[in-house]
């Protein structure tokens, strides 16, 4: 038997993916474990194999269908179980009744690009990926810019309180290399959390024109 405290956390990406992390103090490394998803009102169920991500935690992605298909709705409740093999039997290690649209984490924004760059400002756009049409425009974004000599953790957060897939960064230094990231979160969901940060977009401001006051 496996003893110790267990934590089982899952998030729905709003379309066709439930990502889960299970951590268990004192769990056996060589035990084969999986997550099983059983919706209360659907004809399908799904399983994924838990793979180690650290000494005592495992993760897996339940792929419910095509990436942009709406596989669950706000009314669905999914029973999620962690099952681990004990000899010839499967033992239930953790279980939760999962409300997908109360536990959202969207995919990171994609397709970041510089729309226009000047000496002191830069206009950047992006797209959201695999986000449900349910949200309409009710999403918010956070963005951050990495300046030379600083870390991402030191970068101030810019908040966009609406579905605005662009930003104009001001008061930048001419001829300077920057990096930019953005993340997204729906307003819906008691346990909803921010998406991962996007891949950083590197850009350089234009040099100040010689002999001109910019």
């Amino acid at each position: 038997a496996v003893n110790g405290t267990s934590q089982f956390t899952c998030f729905y990406n709003s379309r066709a993916n439930i990502s889960c992390v299970w951590s268990q103090d004192g769990a056996l490394q060589d035990t084969s474990c999986q997550v099983h998803a059983w919706p209360d009102r659907r004809r399908w169920n799904q399983t994924c194999e838990l793979l180690p991500v650290s000494q005592a935690s495992w993760a897996c992605n339940l792929i419910l269908g095509a990436p942009d298909s709406q596989k669950l709705t706000t009314v669905d409740i999914v029973t999620l179980r962690v099952l681990c093999r004990e000899g010839v039997r499967w033992r239930v290690m953790a279980i939760q009744d999962f409300k997908p649209f109360e536990n959202l984490r969207l995919m990171a924004p994609i397709s970041l690009q510089v729309v226009h760059v000047e000496t002191h400002r830069c206009n950047i756009s992006w797209e959201i990926s695999q986000a449900s049409h349910y949200f309409e425009r009710h999403l918010e974004f956070e963005a951050r810019t990495l300046s030379p000599g600083h870390t991402w953790e030191e970068a101030p957060l810019l908040t966009l309180k609406q579905k605005q897939e662009w930003i104009c960064l001001e008061t930048l230094t001419p001829d300077t290399q920057y990096e930019f990231q953005v993340r997204v979160k729906p307003l819906q969901g008691e346990f909803t959390t921010w998406s991962p940060w996007s891949q950083p977009l590197a850009f350089r401001t234009k040099p100040a024109a010689l002999g001109k006051d910019t």
Partner: antibody
């Protein structure tokens, strides 16, 4: 501009069926949810159900699911609500509305249905 | 089914004054509570979502708050066009349900 324009008032006999239309414009109907809400004089607002045009799914409130059918015609950007086995307590204003599943962002002007023998 | 109870049924307030409308849920609904305004002969209009988030185009005098299962809609300085019926609606459990409404009338 988002618009939902509903069909006109109806007078029906008990036991009959009524079908109300909701023609939309100003947004992509194929990727939207259209909801139907009843507002009866003594009962207030009641959510009847919705249709998800992208997923092709419907969801009905338990109090209506035996008698209501919600459909959509994406070629004409029109949603329909059919209520059968009408009784006097179905006398109400019926609204179509657009929104995510959780709340109703835009509403039609309403259709009055009177059930009387 | 979650029951939404609004109070008072009728509220009489003078123009320019503050109005406070209450909505209580019969069970915990997190922040899944939305407010609508309805004027005579018109469809309801969405005002506030998730307890406190204002909808674009709604005047800043409308605000929402939450304390447990009790939600409040506050109109800071009443204008003549604000006299109407106000409904709350929960989206925590299907079927989603509305309160019976509070009629805000001129004192």
């Amino acid at each position: 501009e988002v618009q939902l324009v509903q069909s006109g008032a109806e007078v029906k006999k008990p036991g009959a069926t009524v079908k109300i239309s909701c023609k939309v414009s100003g947004f992509n109907f194929k990727y939207s949810l259209i909801h139907w809400v009843q507002q009866a004089p003594g009962k207030g607002l009641e959510w009847m159900g919705w249709i998800d045009n992208e997923a092709g799914e419907t969801e009905y409130a338990p109090g209506f699911q035996d008698r209501v059918t919600i459909t959509a015609d994406t070629s004409t950007d029109t949603a329909y609500m059919e209520l059968s086995s009408l009784r006097s307590e179905d006398t109400a204003v019926y609204y179509c509305a657009r929104g995510g599943p959780w709340f109703l962002s835009y509403w039609g002007q309403g259709t009055t249905v009177t059930v009387s023998s | 089914e979650i029951v939404m109870t609004q109070s008072p049924a009728t509220l009489s307030v003078s123009p320019g004054e503050r109005a406070t409308l209450s909505c209580r849920a019969s069970q915990i609904i997190s922040n899944n509570l939305h407010w609508y305004q309805q004027k005579p002969g018109q469809a309801p209009r969405l005002l506030i979502i998730y307890g406190l988030q204002s909808i674009s185009g709604i005047p800043a005098r409308f605000s929402g708050s939450r304390s447990g299962t009790e939600f409040t809609l506050t109109i800071s300085s009443l204008q003549s066009e604000d006299f109407a019926v106000y409904f709350c609606q929960q989206s925590n459990n299907w079927p989603y349900t509305f309160g019976q409404g509070t009629k805000l009338e001129i004192k």
